[in-house]
Amino acid sequence: KKEDGESTAPTPRPKVLRCKCHHHCPEDSVNNICSTDGYCFTMIEEDDSGLPVVTSGCLGLEGSDFQCRDTPIPHQRRSIECCTERNECNKDLHPTLPPLKNRDFVDGPIHHR
């Protein structure tokens, strides 16, 4: 997993990396395998009804450093993990949803009786 503190520009890989893709397969993927010059990823996020959805696939080198950093997004429960160490390495990534914060249960201001 990429560490939050990493800020150096990503180094181009000398060879293409193959990743498993699910719910996130580009047109050039075959048999749920995509190829990239960047990272493989697996992501878990809540859908509109609050159910966890896992997607996986390829991230191109451009912008992947930021995407793999897993910066928290307000009002969105989501976690992403990235890898490059071997082909289809994202099969072994199992990100978990961050815990609910108290305010996530609250739709509006609290009214005391």
């Epitope: 000398p14 060879k15 293409v16 047109e27 995509c34 010059d37 080198l61 071997r86 082909n87």
Partner: antibody, heavy 116, light 112 residues
């Protein structure tokens, strides 16, 4: 200097097995894929498949899947292409080729002749 | 599979003249990363192919600057600006965007 040196020409009978080799030197063998490409007599080039020697991950052209096996031994920087039962139609020149995002270096080729 | 179609199948050009070979793919070769993995190879009799141009327009190291590549999407061109005797060969376009990777049928270039 990047070099891919392939094993010598082979003459085989139908039904026989065969394993040809391709030794890479002058670069980090595990930093590139190795592909195998077939060229039948007087014909064009056909991609058979490839292997990433760092993890032995293979991809095959569906046309050749089950017909050949691609393997590698990173300890001796060598990739292999093998047949368990040759056919006359396997008569061709076989090239190994280094692949990153495109093939940049090719072996000299191994001629395989299958005839009864 | 992506079909790569080259034209013409054969070409005769006078020494010093321009030679142009076209390559058309059955689908776009723009990869999801934004790269276009279309390449050109030269093969002389009894020899393995040699890389000339990678990713549409990048000359490989040691390739003379009379060779150039252009195009986008599905249509690509290899140009030899001034034909030399040593350029007599078969030229192949190739794509590595989609698996299985495929080659054009080849264009035989001769001297007129």
């Amino acid at each position: 200097e990047v070099q891919l040196v392939q094993s010598g020409a082979e003459v085989k009978k139908p039904g026989e097995s065969l394993k040809i080799s391709c030794k890479g030197s002058g670069y980090s063998f595990t930093s590139y894929w190795m592909q195998w490409v077939r060229q039948m007599p007087g014909k064009g080039l056909e991609w058979m498949g490839e292997i990433d020697p760092s993890d032995n991950y293979t991809l095959y052209n569906q046309k050749f899947k089950g017909q050949v096996t691609i393997s590698a031994d990173k300890s001796i920087s060598t990739a292999y292409l093998q047949w368990s039962s040759l056919k006359a139609s396997d008569t061709a020149m076989y090239y190994c080729a280094r692949f990153g995002y495109y093939v940049d270096y090719w072996g000299q080729g191994t001629t395989v002749t299958v005839s009864s | 599979d992506i079909v790569m179609t080259q034209s013409p199948d054969s070409l005769a050009v006078s020494l010093g003249e321009r030679a142009t070979i076209n390559c058309r793919s059955s689908q776009s070769l723009v990869h999801s990363t934004g790269n276009t993995y279309l390449h050109w190879y030269q093969q002389k009799p009894g020899q393995p192919p040699k890389l000339l141009i990678y990713k549409v327009s990048n000359r490989f190291s040691g390739v003379p600057d009379r060779f150039s590549g252009s195009g986008s999407g599905t249509d690509f061109t290899l140009t030899i600006s001034s034909l030399q005797a040593e350029d007599v060969a078969v030229y192949y376009c190739s794509q590595s965007t989609h698996v299985p990777f495929t080659f054009g049928q080849g264009t035989k270039l001769e001297i007129k």
